[in-house]
């Protein structure tokens, strides 16, 4: 089975870890695909290791484990993310995460434009 946090949130400009946990007594993971909606983020395979899709190569870092670290988040990154675990002999298992990217707390407080360096 796949276990994951169904809903997560993170701040704009920040980073988030996307993580699915697969558990089985018999099946072994052979490949894991990560997608943002329909768009490929990254793939891991036992044979080949990690490949991050070129579209996301400046913002997606493999790991920890079989998860992904998604950096420099924008509001447009809000949406559904899917992990697909290819296993042998168990078949294919899918997990879903909904990521909500929120305005940074500074923006919400109206301070983003007015921060200054300390005097001295």
């Amino acid at each position: 089975t796949i276990d994951t946090k169904r809903n997560i949130s993170a701040e704009e400009g920040g980073s988030v870890i996307l993580q699915c946990h697969f558990s089985s007594d018999t099946a072994e993971v052979t490949q894991v695909d990560w997608k943002q909606q329909d768009q490929l983020l990254a793939i891991y395979s036992v044979d080949l290791g990690w490949h991050v899709a070129s579209v996301f190569s400046d913002r997606v870092v493999p790991g920890p484990s079989l998860g992904l670290t998604f950096q420099s988040l924008t509001m447009n990154d809000t949406g559904e993310y899917f992990c697909t675990y290819h296993t042998y002999p168990g078949g294919i298992y899918k997990g879903r995460i909904f990521l909500k990217v929120q305005e940074s707390s500074d923006d919400r407080n109206g301070l983003a434009q007015f921060q200054t360096a300390p005097l001295g």
Partner: antibody
Framework: EVQLLESGGGLVQPGGSLRLSCAAS????????MHWVRQAPGKGLEWVAA????????GYADSVKGRFTISRDNSKNTLYLQMNSLRAEDTAVYYC???????????WGQGTLVTVSS | DIQMTQSPSSLSASVGDRVTITCRAS??????LNWYQQKPGKAPKLLIY???SLQSGVPSRFSGSGSGTDFTLTISSLQPEDFATYYC?????????FGGGTKVEIK
């Protein structure tokens, strides 16, 4: 540098047999699924067969099923296509191809021409 | 089998033109769509994988978009070396299938 070098093509009569080879170098052959794709003269690309990295799983186009057999020898870094009961419509350039993650073809060989004619 | 329909089958364009080629799948294939360029007498070359990811070493004037059933390959400013035939290919399920090709010719 990744290289895929096909050989074994040539002229064969209808009903005859041919064995194509693809020698791979420049990468860990045993980690990749490998495919054969063909192209008839002046036509488009047609997928022929595929084999997983460990040789445990293979698949074929309906047009060649039961006549062609894909195999590999990971110790020799070589992919094979045994073609039996050849027909005129099998005439084509045959390419071997590397397919990472079973997703896209990132490297192709230069191709070998198979001509089936009496 | 999943059918891949490419259009147009051929087009004439000039250096510097923006060129768009479309590919339609007979059923949803998510983003399991790749684009290749082939020049006469040569093997195909991967341009775009997973619908929108640019293969390493391919010029940035090439871009891909789409998901589900409708996909597009765009060449933002056609260069002399881009005159070739372009193929889409789905890897959602076997048998893998290719579009019929689009030949880009000099106007």
């Amino acid at each position: 540098e990744v290289q895929l070098l096909e050989s074994g093509g040539g002229l064969v009569q209808p009903g005859g047999s041919l064995r194509l080879s693809c020698a791979a170098s420049g990468f860990t052959f045993s980690s990749y699924s490998m495919h054969w794709v063909r192209q008839a003269p002046g036509k488009g690309l047609e997928w022929v067969a595929a084999i997983k990295s460990d040789a445990g799983t293979s698949g074929y186009a309906d047009s060649v099923k039961g006549r062609f057999t894909i195999s590999r020898d990971n110790s020799k870094n070589t992919l094979y296509l045994q073609m039996n009961s050849l027909r005129a419509e099998d005439t084509a350039v045959y390419y071997c191809a590397r397919v990472p993650y079973d997703y896209w073809i990132d490297y192709w060989g230069q191709g070998t021409l198979v001509t089936v004619s009496s | 089998d999943i059918q891949m329909t490419q259009s147009p089958s051929s087009l004439s364009a000039s250096v510097g033109d923006r060129v768009t080629i479309t590919c339609r799948a007979s059923q949803s294939i998510s983003s399991y769509l790749n684009w290749y360029q082939q020049k006469p007498g040569k093997a195909p070359k991967l341009l775009i994988y997973a619908a929108s990811s640019l293969q390493s070493g391919v010029p940035s004037r090439f871009s891909g978009s789409g998901s589900g059933t409708d996909f597009t390959l765009t060449i933002s400013s056609l260069q002399p070396e881009d005159f070739a035939t372009y193929y889409c290919q789905q890897s959602y399920s076997t048998p893998l299938t290719f579009g019929g090709g689009t030949k880009v010719e000099i106007k």
